[in-house]
């Protein structure tokens, strides 16, 4: 007996699609070996139609796929646009030849069933409206009109022209005539449900002179669209329910036996399991909307349905669209930390993976906000200016070729806690979600800058020092000047590096930066940080104010600017710390639910790089231009 298992008999009708699942024993060899689907010929030869090696026969071109699910030990053959010629004997199997392990499948494709000549077939989706057309002769123009539904031999009246309506069709069925038409009446049945399907008879008049028409109503549950996504990637459900529900609340739900549990709706409901990784985006005024879910998990696989109803909940007889989501565990997207922890006043360095084949793509970092349908305004990007409230404390470091970029956020406050998304304008699957948890600091920060009141005088020499603990001894220390398009590394001098590597004096580990001579444009935020290769670690920030020699009062109160890193709430950030004429990025968050477009994030801020020569051991640490 074959260890491969599948459906022995598959029957369908012309024009339909079938999905044939074949199960195989769970072994490493089976998971990785070739999977195939072949058609058995009279001569005993089985001709391959499609295989997991990428082969696709001419007769299956554009209408078939074979997808392996190694984690479930199954593979699925999807065949669309069936014709009667597809009827025959097939094998689904494993192995390098079509003689290995296989299972016999019989496929029968029949014609769409025919009804009596006078039967009109109406095919409608659940929740839609059908208009049944009933013709009659002039002699019955003033006679009673009715529509009944066949149940066995009986025909139960649904609606008639005396204003009778069957209770199960109440508020759903209307009988009417159009304009001056004297030979036709219509019955509308709205909010169709599966039990509405069947044979209807419409009648004008009574007895032998009555005019009768047969109507076969087929009510279709939406055939789920199959979506195959990788673990940790993202999926977008594009929902188009039609104009008639444009003004009703929209929802996406996940089928769970008898119910469909709402994941998100436009009335503000959201399943906690999708917190931080879901966005619902209205597309237009015709009721189109999309739902984006990032950071896909194995348990996200299943049947999903979108719909519309004033309650924001699934309701029988309202239009729906359906999907079946498969989550493939053999993912190309690397596993990255989903929770990053920081402390107030400290910093975090978040590594964002992206498709290494798309190193030139634009990188972004956005803050997921829970309000209503969820949104994700961009905070920083490779060509997006840093958003207000994040000046001096947020930067994106691209590391071309590494398949990752790093986002650093410092001067943390508890208000920074929340969900953030890494995304690019390239491969939309590579969207990752990070939850940032900021706790109150219980000890001094690892990096400390002196002097804390940093005011430099134009034309003079100004040095700031960054004290670091011995645990950072072997790491690379750096100073950088923050600007709206990143933090540009400056020459600096590591005092601690002169010591022997055996001992480490906790009090004398210093990396310093000197501005010589100080210029007006040196004013701004400076960061001291540590890193190992391209792996960024802790940072701390300080605002350096620059004043004229002659002036008695400084341009800015540096204590206020730097207090933010210690204990001031985010809202109290200095207003004048960045030029007000800079272009602020203002990306519409809805663009990020769209797989196709991410708009240019605005003019790039003018670069403000400091450069110079690293100083000698004597302490001359370089200058900024």
């Amino acid at each position: 007996q074959s260890p491969i298992f599948g459906p022995q008999d598959v029957s369908s009708i012309e024009g339909n699609s079938v999905s044939i699942t074949c199960y195989y024993p769970d072994t490493s060899v089976n998971r990785h070996t070739r999977k195939y689907w072949c058609r058995q010929g009279a001569n005993g030869y089985c001709a391959t139609l499609i295989s997991s090696n990428g082969y696709l026969s001419k007769e299956y071109s554009g209408r078939a796929s074979l997808i392996n699910f190694p984690e479930n030990s199954t593979f699925v053959i999807n065949i669309a646009h069936l014709t009667q010629e597809d009827t025959g004997s097939y094998k689904c199997g494993l192995g390098t030849t079509n003689r290995g392990l296989f299972f016999d499948v019989s496929l029968e494709v029949s014609q769409v069933p025919e009804f009596p000549n006078d039967t009109h077939v109406y095919t409608k989706d659940i929740g839609r409206t059908v208009t049944i057309e009933c013709r009659f002769k002039e002699g019955n123009a003033h006679s009673k009109k009715s529509l009944c539904k066949k149940r066995g031999e009986a025909c139960e009246v649904v609606i008639d022209s005396t204003e009778y309506v069957d209770p199960s069709y109440k508020d759903r069925a209307i009988l009417f005539m159009k304009g001056t038409s004297r030979d036709i009446f219509y019955v509308n049945i709205s909010h169709l449900i599966p039990s509405d399907a069947g044979l209807y008879v419409c009648q004008a008049g009574e007895g032998p002179s009555a005019d009768k028409n047969n109507a076969d109503l087929q009510v279709l549950e939406p055939e789920p669209e199959l979506l195959y996504k990788d673990l940790r990637s993202s999926v977008t459900f594009e929902c188009d329910l039609g104009r008639e529900v444009a003004n009703d609340a929209k929802y996406l739900c996940r089928k769970n036996k008898e119910t469909c549990d709402v994941i998100i709706n436009t009335l503000g409901k959201r399943d906690p399991a999708f917190e931080g990784r879901i966005l619902l985006t209205p597309r237009d005024d015709n009721g189109r909307f999309s739902v984006l879910i990032t950071g896909l998990r194995k348990e996200d696989a299943g049947h999903y349905q979108c719909g519309a109803h004033s309650s924001g909940l699934p309701q029988e007889g309202w239009p729906v669209q359906a999907w079946q989501l498969f989550v493939n565990e053999e993912s190309t997207i690397p596993n990255s930390r989903s929770v990053v922890k920081g402390v107030t006043g400290g910093s975090v360095a978040i590594v964002c993976p992206y498709n290494p084949k798309e190193s030139s793509s634009l990188k972004y970092w956005c803050h997921w906000e829970a309000d209503e349908n969820g949104r994700c305004p961009v905070l920083v990007g490779t060509q997006a200016l840093v958003q207000e409230g994040y000046e001096g404390r947020l930067a994106l470091f691209d590391q071309p070729g590494s398949g990752a970029y790093t986002v650093i956020l410092n001067q943390l406050t508890t208000q920074d806690s929340g969900f953030y998304w890494c995304l690019t304008d390239g491969d939309s699957r590579w969207r990752t979600t990070i939850e940032l948890q900021v706790a109150e600091a219980t000890k001094k920060p690892d990096l400390e800058v002196t002097p804390q009141n940093a005011t430099a005088v134009i034309g003079e020499t100004f040095t700031i020092s960054c004290h670091y603990p011995c645990k950072f001894y072997s790491q690379e220390k750096y100073w950088c000047k923050w600007s709206n398009d990143g933090c540009h590394i400056l020459p600096s001098h590591d005092e601690g590096a002169r010591q022997s590597s055996v001992s480490c004096d906790q009090s004398s580990q210093i990396v310093s930066m000197t501005l010589n001579p100080v210029k007006k444009e040196d004013e701004g935020w400076y960061w001291c940080g540590v890193k190992e290769g391209q792996v960024y670690g802790e940072t701390t920030a300080i605002y350096v104010a620059v004043e004229e020699r002659t002036r008695g009062s400084p341009h800015i109160n540096p204590t206020d600017a730097n207090a933010r890193a210690k204990d001031a709430p985010e809202e109290e950030a200095m207003e004048s710390s960045v030029r007000e004429d800079e272009n602020k990025a203002n990306l519409d968050p809805r663009l990020f639910a769209d797989e196709r477009e991410i708009q240019n994030a605005g003019d790039q801020a003018q670069e403000n790089r400091a450069s110079g020569n690293a100083g000698s051991a004597g302490g001359q640490s370089g200058s900024s231009k």
Epitope: P7, V10, S12, V18, I20, Y23, F69, L226, H303
Partner: nanobody, 129 residues
């Protein structure tokens, strides 16, 4: 809530035939799955056959041990499944359970009880030699 009621079981001689029925009430599925499992005394519940339907498609699955002898079908009203059993032998003696569900995930193994949400009480089939 869906109720499943099996009928058609009984005592039959080896080589004989029986037709089991499983009537579902409470809800109709426009797409779904109905299956038959059996449990002989002192043994584990085992898969016999299943029928899955969706959008005009029907898929029939059989256990290797009943292939060619048993046939599963359902009526068009989508409420009853049948198991036509032929060439019965004493090893077929068991309590036969009907199980049903809405269409499960495409890659859940239908031979396991897990995908089936609704179960009947069972009908006894005894095959004497």
């Amino acid at each position: 809530e869906v109720q499943l009621v099996e009928s058609g079981g009984g005592l039959v001689q080896a080589g004989g035939s029986l037709r089991l029925s499983c009537a579902a009430s409470g809800r109709t599925f426009s797409s779904g799955i109905m299956g038959w499992f059996r449990q002989a005394p002192g043994k584990e519940r085992e898969f016999v056959a299943a029928i899955e339907w969706s959008g005009g498609n029907t898929y029939k699955y059989y256990a290797e041990s009943v292939k060619g002898r048993f046939a599963i079908s359902r009526d068009n009203a989508k409420t009853t499944a049948y198991l036509q059993m032929g060439s019965l032998n004493p090893e077929d003696t068991a309590l036969y359970y009907c199980a049903a569900d809405e269409s499960p995930s495409r890659y859940i193994d239908l031979r396991r009880p897990a995908p089936y949400h609704y179960w009947g009480q069972g009908t006894l089939v005894t095959v004497s030699s």
